[in-house]
Amino acid sequence: TPLGPKWPEPVFGRLASPGFPGEYANDQERRWTLTAPPGYRLRLYFTHFDLELSHLCEYDFVKLSSGAKVLATLCGQESTDTERAPGKDTFYSLGSSLDITFRSDYSNEKPFTGFEAFYAAEDIDECQVAPGEAPTCDHHCHNHLGGFYCSCRAGYVLHRNKRTCSALCSGQVFTQRSGELSSPEYPRPYPKLSSCTYSISLEEGFSVILDFVESFDVETHPETLCPYDFLKIQTDREEHGPFCGKTLPHRIETKSNTVTITFVTDESGDHTGWKIHYTSTAQPCPYPMAPPNGHVSPVQAKYILKDSFSIFCETGYELLQGHLPLKSFTAVCQKDGSWDRPMPACSIVDCGPPDDLPSGRVEYITGPGVTTYKAVIQYSCEETFYTMKVNDGKYVCEADGFWTSSKGEKSLPVCEPVCGLSARTTGGRIYGGQKAKPGDFPWQVLILGGTTAAGALLYDNWVLTAAHAVYEQKHDASALDIRMGTLKRLSPHYTQAWSEAVFIHEGYTHDAGFDNDIALIKLNNKVVINSNITPICLPRKEAESFMRTDDIGTASGWGLTQRGFLARNLMYVDIPIVDHQKCTAAYEKPPYPRGSVTANMLCAGLESGGKDSCRGDSGGALVFLDSETERWFVGGIVSWGSMNCGEAGQYGVYTKVINYIPWIENIISDF
């Protein structure tokens, strides 16, 4: 029996009956065995077929078989009901070998020419399976020349049998207090040859509860307990299971904070698996009762381990742990069933006793000593000498615990001294000045520090003076001896003040004229305002209307009198303002240099002389009455004049204060 080609030879060729294309002889038997490489099959088709037809091809035939299976027995020229001729059919081996047998019997009624066939090896597509057959691969099948291979979807791994996909279902750890877990692909059939391990791991103190839900379907056996697929549940205390079959297992209260669930499947079966809903419980903490004027959030039926609540107080109440303030409060339930923090109180906000108001007082409006939420107090300033600055003085205890004004300010109101008050009414002009009476010039300041000079009180902690009067002390402010509240220069009864700093106008040049002859002294303490110590006002924008030529101003001081000595008693003089051009002309004659009188100066005095300020008065205020406000304001600062005070045709020269309002305001606000 001739043998066909054997792999690894090229597998293709031609087969023909003996004597083809002539007629074949009787009593012939030929057998060809074709072998293809692994993963290949053989394809065979006939180009000519002419054999004796007999019932069931008993006489002459070509038989195709692959392994033990007969693929076809062929005879005749065309197929009949009971016999088959190949026609245009193509035949395929089942594996990699194909046997072809040709036989003729002892006789032929007429000559038959036999057959001619061609064969070739071709790749088997193992991935194509007939309907109803098991798929080649569990998930993905990949054909290639001479073979195939399987692969798996994400979350699976190829089993060592190279076809089954086992689920990668181990190592999942559930740490939430509740959750769900199920067999892979649930509710679709679970994978074969898999071993799944799930862990529930909660904090110590929790106890896991397992509920099987929806459906349960794990391959079982009528006689043996779960021999194929099974589910087991393990805690540190005990093991539950194995479970299989179609009945939902009962709830499992594990009394453990850690649970391991194992699910093992074999290579066969088609079952939907299981789903578990787990919850947890723990020893509950005492139910939190909200303190009066507070509420608990969130409200729960019970609070167990890790549950928390916060306390929120009503408006006007604050969280206090005893005397300790808390902005927020959250307590957490512990595993022993106790809260980690003691309950605070919601105490009514207490703003406490209001701060004392310098030069003022406070009155309890709501009730004596009541300082709690919504209580009202009223600040007021000492009448006559102080007035409240930009505030009505009414304060309310607000929820933040601060006394707050109607404008929302938390700072105290300011009692500002009333300026420009004087006991004096404008009197007649007395030649050479006259003695001041108590309260006439309460802004008058005596400055001792090498020489005698004067100044005027501004607010309750500043003195306005001439730059030349304090120039020598600009770097040693503490050397200035500042006295106020007295009329007599040598009296031991006065209010003492000390300088903290001296500010000389940056445009003043000592010994080079008197332009910008202005300075401020900051006192190291506020002085108490009374009828004998009251600040002078600064000029308003409209003040120039009270300082026109011939308007009367008043100069005061302890400077030289007509007798040539410093005055013992404070003296004052009422003098008119002199036309600026007239004054400029008076001081353009020698010995005065040109330009001595500048736009920053004003002049006052009589053309006939006799009324003037003099040495020792330097730095004092030339004041005017503002008839609209009925307050005195400083229009000039005693600066310079003729060598002979009160000389006819010469005038006292004063620093024009209105030109320096921005400078004064800047210094005072900055320091």
Epitope: Q321, G322, H323, L324, P325, K327, S328, P342, D400, F402
Partner: antibody, heavy 117, light 112 residues
Framework: DVQLQESGPGLVKPSQSLSLTCTVT?????????WNWIRQFPGNKLEWMGY???????NYNPSLKSRFSITRDTSKNQFFLQLNSVTTEDTATYYC??????????WGQGTLVTVSA | DVLMTQTPLSLPVSLGDQASISCRSS???????????LEWYLQKPGQSPKLLIY???NRFSGVPDRFSGSGSGTDFTLKISRVEAEDLGVYYC?????????FGAGTKLELK
């Protein structure tokens, strides 16, 4: 974790003012709680001086109230002690401390202040 | 002010001994909210005080369980079941129920 650090002059003259700073790290002084000053005299006696709360409100030991104040700078996360008109009796180690539901769970390491001419 | 009186002022012990420190307040230190703000502090040489016990009997975090506090009203006790070397120092009781809050004078725990 919250940390507190005191700083200031080690020597102050009588009648002057004492100013100390407590610098807080790891927690904002406006977030919560009370921020305290405590001092310990040479004989080991401890005295609570007062606190400033997260909101800026203060609570002082009445024995010191007239010459003592606590302020803060929230931008620098610092709070301050000012004690006026000091005498030799104010020589002590000064501590700052933070409260919780209890008074002084967190302390600074302390700074010694000597009042001497 | 509430005066806190500690006894003894000095307590010599051997390592492993039990130690007991008493603290008495001049008036009840039960706060109006019902809590008793009694605390114990330990100060070791060169260190700031450290909180041990709050609200009479609660151990602060990290404090060993050999420390225990008890008492009520005006009488309070701190016990150390087995003294260790690291426990040596000055112990202060403290009341936080009334302003001004006040400390005891201290008890020095030292080796015999």
């Amino acid at each position: 974790d919250v940390q507190l650090q005191e700083s200031g002059p080690g020597l102050v003259k009588p009648s002057q003012s004492l100013s100390l700073t407590c610098t807080v790290t790891g927690f904002s002084i406006t977030s919560d709680y009370a921020w305290n000053w405590i001092r310990q005299f040479p004989g080991n006696k401890l005295e609570w001086m007062g606190y400033i709360s997260y909101s800026g409100r203060t609570n002082y030991n009445p024995s010191l109230k007239s010459r003592f104040s606590i302020t803060r700078d929230t931008s620098k996360n610092q709070f301050f002690l000012q004690l006026n008109s000091v005498t030799t009796e104010d020589t002590a180690t000064y501590y700052c401390a933070r409260s919780y539901d209890y008074w002084f769970p967190y302390w600074g390491q302390g700074t010694l202040v000597t009042v001497s001419a | 002010d509430v005066l806190m009186t500690q006894t003894p002022l000095s307590l010599p012990v051997s390592l492993g001994d039990q130690a007991s420190i008493s603290c008495r307040s001049s008036q009840s230190i039960v706060h109006s909210n019902g809590n008793t703000f009694l605390e114990w502090y330990l100060q070791k040489p060169g260190q700031s005080p450290k909180l041990l016990i709050y609200k009479v009997s609660n151990r602060f975090s990290g404090v060993p369980d050999r420390f225990s506090g008890s008492g009520s009203g005006t009488d309070f006790t701190l016990k150390i079941s087995r003294v260790e070397a690291e426990d040596l120092g000055v112990y202060y009781c403290f009341q936080g129920s009334h302003i001004p809050v006040t400390f005891g004078a201290g008890t020095k725990l030292e080796l015999k």
